[in-house]
């Protein structure tokens, strides 16, 4: 599992393998913070709940982040 509690960032390795949306349970977005200088995207897969860190620089994830920030600006008070 590419997660670590000993480093400041959650992800210690990043998968560049494309993710099939059908196999995704959920995607968690952890924004950059004082603890970790980069945004982290954690994918939980449907099978066995395996967690995978995705590349935030990939086109798909950039699209996703764009869509989330659009949604956020729509819903923010």
């Amino acid at each position: 599992v590419p997660l670590s509690r000993t480093v400041r960032c959650t992800c210690i390795s990043i998968s560049n393998q494309p993710v099939n949306p059908r196999s995704l349970e959920k995607l968690e977005i952890i924004p950059a913070s004082q603890f970790c200088p980069r945004v982290e995207i954690i994918a939980t897969m449907k099978k066995k709940g395996e967690k995978r860190c995705l590349n935030p620089e990939s086109k798909a994830i950039k699209n996703l982040l764009k869509a989330v920030s659009k949604e956020r600006s729509k819903r923010s008070p």
Epitope: P21, L27, S33, A60, L64, A67, R75
Partner: antibody
């Protein structure tokens, strides 16, 4: 409200290919999946495959594997379905439909979660009749 | 041959209650949800029921769905003449890795 508008009817010769387009309006194109189906005369609905534009990944029905290509152009909010090696058995009404939708929860927290809900095909194109005849 | 099995036809008189069944297996209905579609003559299909028993907005509550094991059911109560249409059940199949449909049920309102 999302709307899907498909390209017009086609008449093709056996052995040729056909490309049907499906243009989405009224929603964020990249935040849902587009499914392609067909219905031959007197037959039931048949799933051909789907694409999630945001991920650029297509899934295909085993029956059409190698003969169908589904793609999407985010700049024009248009999905395409190309079917090659046409025979008279491919004469059918072809539909695009919206399937999986991205839902964002915990949006205003610092850890938003994204799930993709496949709740059925709730928006359909008007259909494109493809006739294969020599 | 469709992966899901539906009766080819069903009928009823106005006001009656009609049930359409849809039988599958452990790789589709047994492990995934059932959707139902209505196809009126000359129109594109319309989603009637999703997630086994949920109705999209705008669908009258005369339409209801349920799932038990590897089968699903669509119930139309208070049948109306405008319900005369083809009805299809659908699910995702984990073995085939694709959406699968029933062959459709032609409902006639007598």
């Amino acid at each position: 409200q999302v709307q899907l508008v498909q390209s017009g009817a086609e008449v093709k010769k056996p052995g040729s290919s056909v490309t049907v387009s499906c243009k989405a309006s009224g929603g964020t194109f990249s935040s849902f999946s587009i499914t392609w189906l067909r219905q031959a005369p007197g037959q039931g609905l048949e799933w051909m495959g789907e694409i999630t534009p945001m991920f650029g990944i297509a899934n295909y029905a085993q029956k059409f594997q190698g003969r169908v290509t589904i793609s999407a152009d985010e700049s024009t909010s248009t999905a395409y379905m190309e079917l090659s090696g046409l025979t008279s058995e491919d004469t059918a009404m072809y539909y695009c439909a919206r399937d999986g939708r991205f839902d964002v929860s915990d949006l205003l927290t610092d850890k938003p979660k994204v799930t993709i809900n496949y709740n059925g095909m709730d928006v359909w194109g008007q259909g494109t009749l493809v006739t294969v005849s020599s | 041959q469709s992966v899901l099995t539906q009766p080819p036809s069903a009928s009823g008189t106005p006001g009656q209650r009609v049930t359409i069944s849809c039988s599958g297996s452990s790789s589709n209905i047994g492990s995934n949800t059932v959707n139902w579609y209505q196809r009126l003559p000359g129109a594109a299909p319309q989603l009637l029921i999703y997630n086994n028993d949920q109705r999209p907005s705008g669908i009258p509550d005369r339409f209801s769905g349920s799932k038990s094991g590897t089968s699903g059911s669509l119930v139309i109560s208070g049948l109306q003449s405008e319900d005369e249409a083809d009805y299809y059940c659908a699910s995702w199949d984990d073995s085939l890795n694709g959406r699968v449909f029933g062959g459709g049920t032609k409902l006639t309102v007598l």
